[in-house]
């Protein structure tokens, strides 16, 4: 069964995404598995479905259970399961293991701690950050977008970090907290001006109209864990999120790989149902770090159809 674990605290907002993905135009139906009861879509309900998202605003311990999402895709309905557990708030400071998200590691040169699941919520900066339940204060700590940056990391910075933010739904505010462990590793490394491995500068990518196309932007930034390194795509000089074409999406998150000891990142641009107008766009792969920014441009061209039947 295609299932995903999700958890939250009572009286906080919890938003869960259907583990089965589909096009934005596909209808998604949600059910409470134990009773096969349909989850309403009306936002006046405390628990309601909104496309691929299931929203608990706020969550209650009794909401715990398995929820079924059915993506009404063509040909076959695709089924996913969200295993949701809502816990009572702890009176003491300790965050139990079952509430912890994945551990992240950092070093003197790279100390970014991402706030887990925040991309599912409608939140506004700044985030509040706590370490072992104490609010973080001092110039060494910087809340930047959805992550925390710690300057001059020391071994004493290891511990459990909690991010707290407000989710807004139709004018109502709901608190959300998420905790993950941070470990510090001693690392000898260096950073370079970004080197883009793919695509080649001014590359022409052949695509077929009506099919999907993937473009991968891949760059290396030095050795060891890097501080503030990123790769991203732009369309005609505009961020993907601002361009406003739902068929064209960046893959969520950046994959970090170490090839020959080098720290590299890649970002996949997915174009669904390629259209003629996509051939007119300029696709820019951008790689940036503290040294600067490098840009490689790609254009699409129509592929000459070839017979590939067996």
């Amino acid at each position: 069964k295609f299932s995903k674990q999700s958890w939250g605290l009572e009286n906080e907002a919890l938003i869960v995404r259907c583990p089965r993905q589909g096009k934005p135009s596909y209808t998604v139906d949600w059910y409470y598995s134990q009773t096969n009861k349909s989850i309403p879509t009306q936002e006046r309900n405390r628990v309601f479905a909104s496309g691929q998202l299931l929203k608990f605003l706020p969550a209650a311990v009794a909401d715990s259970g398995i929820y079924t999402c059915i993506v009404r895709s063509p040909t076959f309905n695709r089924t996913g399961y969200a295993n949701v557990t809502i816990y009572k708030k702890q009176s003491d400071c300790n965050v139990p293991d079952y509430l912890m998200y994945s551990t992240v590691s950092g070093s003197e040169k790279n100390s970014k701690i991402y706030c887990p699941t925040i991309d599912l919520y409608n939140w506004t900066a700044p985030l509040e950050w706590f370490k072992n339940c104490q609010a973080l204060q001092g110039s060494r700590y910087r809340a930047h977008k959805s992550f925390l940056v710690i300057d001059n990391v020391m071994t004493e910075d290891a511990g459990d970090y909690t991010c707290k933010f407000i989710h807004n739904e139709n004018g109502a505010n709901y608190s959300v907290t998420a905790t993950r462990s941070f470990t510090v590793k001693d690392e000898q490394g260096f950073s370079l001006f970004p080197v883009i491995g793919a695509p080649a500068q001014n590359e022409i990518k052949e695509v077929e109209i009506g099919k999907n196309a993937n473009l991968t932007c891949s760059a290396c930034f030095g050795k060891g864990t890097q501080f503030l390194a990123a790769v991203l795509w732009q369309l005609n000089g505009t961020k993907i999120t601002d361009f406003g074409e739902p068929r064209i999406q960046q893959e969520e998150g950046q994959n970090q790989s170490f090839s020959n000891g080098l720290a590299c990142l890649d970002m996949v641009l997915r174009i669904a149902d390629v259209k003629e107008e996509d051939l007119l766009l300029q696709y820019d792969c951008l790689a940036l770090n503290l040294h600067g920014l490098r840009r490689h441009t790609v254009r699409l061209s129509r592929k000459n159809p070839i017979d590939h039947h067996s």
Epitope: F2, T27, P74, T75, N212, H308, H309
Partner: antibody, heavy 121, light 111 residues
Framework: EVQLVESGGGLVQPGGSLRLSCAAS????????MYWVRQATGKGLEWVSA???????YYPGSVKGRFTISRENAKNSLYLQMNSLRVGDTAVYYC???????????????WGQGTTVTVSS | DIVMTQSPLSLPVTPGEPASISCRSG???????????LDWYLQKPGQSPQLLIY???NRASGVPDRFSGSGSGTDFTLKISRVEAEDVGVYYC????????FGQGTRLEIK
């Protein structure tokens, strides 16, 4: 070259079992939905089963409970386990490639050469 | 199940002449994503089926441009602008909106 090759067909008695295999090559097998389609001699095409990229399976009523489709991505292989076979299951069985991992659809664009299953006493 | 009905069942054509096959579905094949989930396949004598048209009107890779698909909802047409000898075989329409069902097939033969 993108290719699908079926095997495992043969003669079997009614009530018997048979396991068909389909070896895929030339594409990322794990990223595609896969299908079995059959064709009785002189008849039309009939969809038999499908399996999506996460292993969920789909069947028409005529074979549900008797046939089981499965896949082994590490071996680029698709299987059809056929139990409680009936004379009416006699046909050429084709495996075919369907849409890709993000539900884009562009038909069954690759077909194998087929393997013959004969159910007779 | 969605029933697919093709006509004619047999189609004798003179080479160089156009040909047209109709396919009617028991319910609309138009999905909320804006596409008609209707394919056309050709099975040449002694061969496996091959995809010609997907999503109603999109020609598959390697398919000559004399083949075209049209229609929406419940009525679809496959047209061959100039029939060639190699086009002989059985043509099937197939719906992929709700599971999969094929039409009964149209046999195209050369006069």
């Amino acid at each position: 070259e993108v290719q699908l090759v079926e095997s495992g067909g043969g003669l079997v008695q009614p009530g018997g079992s048979l396991r068909l295999s389909c070896a895929a090559s030339g594409f990322t097998f794990s990223s595609y939905d896969m299908y079995w389609v059959r064709q009785a001699t002189g008849k039309g095409l009939e969809w038999v089963s499908a399996i999506d990229t996460v292993g969920d399976t789909y069947y028409p009523g005529s074979v549900k409970g008797r046939f089981t489709i499965s896949r082994e991505n590490a071996k680029n292989s698709l299987y059809l386990q056929m139990n409680s076979l009936r004379v009416g299951d006699t046909a050429v069985y084709y495996c075919a490639r369907g849409g890709d991992y993000d539900y884009s659809y562009y038909g069954m664009d690759v077909w194998g050469q087929g393997t013959t299953v004969t159910v007779s006493s | 199940d969605i029933v697919m009905t093709q006509s004619p069942l047999s189609l004798p054509v003179t080479p160089g002449e156009p040909a047209s096959i109709s396919c009617r579905s028991g319910q609309s094949l138009l999905h909320s994503d804006g596409y008609n989930y209707l394919d056309w396949y050709l099975q040449k004598p002694g061969q496996s089926p091959q995809l010609l048209i997907y999503l109603g009107s999109n020609r598959a890779s390697g398919v000559p441009d004399r083949f075209s698909g049209s229609g929406s909802g419940t009525d679809f047409t496959l047209k061959i602008s100039r029939v060639e000898a190699e086009d002989v075989g059985v043509y099937y329409c197939m719906q992929a909106l709700q599971t999969i069902t094929f039409g009964q097939g149209t046999r195209l033969e050369i006069k």
